[in-house]
């Protein structure tokens, strides 16, 4: 409950906000959930707490885990959880689904792409912007404050946009990147019965006990902007929110991407610290639109290690 997913790349800055709302004057204590060990507030530490914010300067893969924040007002103590995952830098240009922020849609009249989470950081303009890993050049692209404006948007402008900026903390600079998909609204659209691209029905995924794993539910719904198109995960036929296991979280935003002109939506189920009991669960990827519902089931199995003699 009151758990928020946050993610970042190793050697970049990551700043996480406690998911409980309150005043800046409230005292906020941060802890490592597993050990209940208090997180220091001294800025000389690589990981330190600063009021409602938890700062990783820079982040390391080993920082992944659940962090507890307790917001202390004069009248109440409120508890929240930050579920942090730090990933290794990708060697190639491809940005995996689990690193994507929520999708934005644009049209000829409105083509703003906001840089996700930037308001948490101490940054100075200008931002650098990349599309599918290529630096954006040309007069059509204008980096304005915390967003990118594209003039005369065309369907070709759809794709993955990455913003890059520098966070400054006490004179030290740290790089931050964030990627989100941009879709272009197409007036001549249509919708189809959902087609689930992943997972395959009755698929089995091998996992390591104690490791983290991600399951992507991806479905296509037609062409152009869709009135209703949603994908979600269910555990043993129940909604994720009804399944009170903070290790298993569905990402908040649903990423919309266009594949061969089709409108496709993804959502990632993140399972931290895989346990034996997770192998007993049935994981259902559900895709729903006005035409109906389609369901694909995936199960987890323990990875078999082949011993060579």
């Amino acid at each position: 409950k009151f758990s928020k997913q946050s993610w970042g790349l190793e050697n970049e800055a990551l700043i996480v906000r406690c998911p409980r709302q309150g005043k800046s004057s409230y005292i906020v204590d941060w802890y490592y959930s597993q050990t209940n060990k208090s997180i220091p507030t001294q800025e000389r530490n690589r990981v330190f707490a600063s009021g409602q914010l938890l700062k990783f300067l820079p982040a390391e893969v080993a920082d992944s885990g659940i962090y507890t924040c307790i917001v202390r007002s004069p009248t109440f103590n409120r508890t929240g959880y930050a579920n942090v995952t730090i990933y290794k830098k990708q060697p190639d240009c491809n940005v995996p689904d689990y690193l994507m922020y929520s999708t934005v849609s644009g049209s000829e009249k409105n083509s703003k792409i906001y840089c996700p989470t930037i308001d948490l950081y101490n940054w100075t303009a200008p931002l650098e912007w990349f599309k599918n890993c290529q630096a954006l050049q040309g007069s059509r692209y204008k980096a304005h404050k915390s967003f990118l404006v594209i003039d005369n948007v065309m369907t070709d402008d759809a794709g993955d946009y990455t913003c890059k900026f520098i966070h400054n903390e006490n004179g030290a600079n740290y790089s931050v990147t964030a990627t989100r998909s941009f879709t272009v609204k197409d007036e001549q659209g249509f919708s189809l019965f959902p087609v689930i691209r992943a997972p395959a029905h009755n698929e089995t995924k091998e996992v390591e006990i104690g490791e983290n794993t991600n399951l992507t539910c991806s479905a296509c719904f037609g062409k152009g902007a869709q009135f209703l198109a949603t994908v979600q995960w269910q555990l043993n036929g129940n909604k994720i929110t009804d399944f009170s296991e903070p290790r298993i979280q569905q990402e908040e935003g649903q990423n919309q991407s266009f594949s061969n002109g089709l409108a496709c939506v993804n959502t990632v189920l993140r399972i931290a610290d895989v346990k034996e009991e997770d192998l007993l669960l049935r994981y259902d990827c559900l895709a729903l639109n006005l035409h109906g519902l389609r369901r694909h089931t995936i199960r987890l199995s323990r990875k078999h290690h082949h011993h060579h003699h």
Partner: antibody
Framework: EVQLVQSGAEVKKPGATVKISCKVS????????MHWVQQAPGKGLEWMGR????????EYAEKFQGRVTITADTSTDTAYMELSSLRSEDTAVYYC??????????WGQGTLVTVSS | DIQMTQSPSSLSASVGDRVTITCITN??????IHWYQQKPGKAPKLLIY???TLRPGVPSRFSGSGSGTDFTFTISSLQPEDIATYYC????????FGQGTKLEIK
């Protein structure tokens, strides 16, 4: 102990405006949020809105949007709720209550506002 | 807007009885549900916050449970001084009170 003392009962004509005060003692009004709640005679509680007195940020329930204004004077630790364009159905007891963003912990004694022609 | 359905609207019970009041929301909320007691002519009093956290000084016969959309408030052994109207409050999105449950002694 935290105390919230509200201004006295009011009788108003339809179309008029009422302004109720709520003075906080043993507590710094800037340290938390101030909420206002309406309760019509024999009816349930209805949340009207809240203010963060330190910065003046307000949020109002849709039902009261446009007619209610919540303010706070941090120098006197007093919050105010003003309700305009009064109608007979606004006849109610109005409570101020301090708390955090999510709930109210300490309440005033209530102020009865009667709207009658 | 989040709607709250509180039931029953009134109930009559004997001293020593176990009393249960429920609140159902039309959308999944975190445990941002709180329970208030209001005695006639008095301001409401907070008993339980965040679903199940007892406010200091509140007797342990009062408890709260539930998550998602279904929440329950329980008085394990009704006392004469518990005669009041009880309200749930959600604060997941703005704040909304339930309709109230008037509790009387048989």
């Amino acid at each position: 102990e935290v105390q919230l003392v509200q201004s006295g009962a009011e009788v108003k004509k339809p179309g008029a405006t009422v302004k109720i005060s709520c003075k906080v003692s043993a507590f710094n009004i800037k340290d938390d949020y101030m909420h206002w709640v309406q309760q019509a005679p024999g009816k349930g509680l209805e949340w009207m809105g809240r203010i963060d007195p330190a910065i003046g940020n307000t949020e109002y329930a849709e039902k009261f949007q446009g007619r209610v204004t919540i303010t706070a004077d941090t120098s006197t630790d007093t919050a105010y709720m003003e309700l305009s364009s009064l109608r007979s159905e606004d006849t109610a007891v109005y409570y101020c209550a301090t708390g955090d963003f999510y709930a109210m912990a300490y309440w005033g004694q209530g102020t009865l506002v009667t709207v009658s022609s | 807007d989040i709607q709250m359905t509180q039931s029953p609207s009134s109930l009559s019970a004997s001293v020593g009885d176990r009393v249960t009041i429920t609140c159902i929301t039309n959308t999944d909320i975190d445990d941002v549900i709180h329970w208030y007691q209001q005695k006639p002519g008095k301001a409401p009093k907070l008993l339980i916050y965040e679903g199940n956290t007892l406010r200091p000084g509140v007797p342990s016969r009062f408890s709260g449970s539930g998550s998602g959309t279904d929440f329950t408030f329980t008085i394990s052994s009704l006392q004469p001084e518990d005669i009041a109207t009880y309200y749930c409050l959600q604060s997941d999105n703005m704040l909304t009170f339930g309709q109230g449950t008037k509790l009387e002694i048989k």
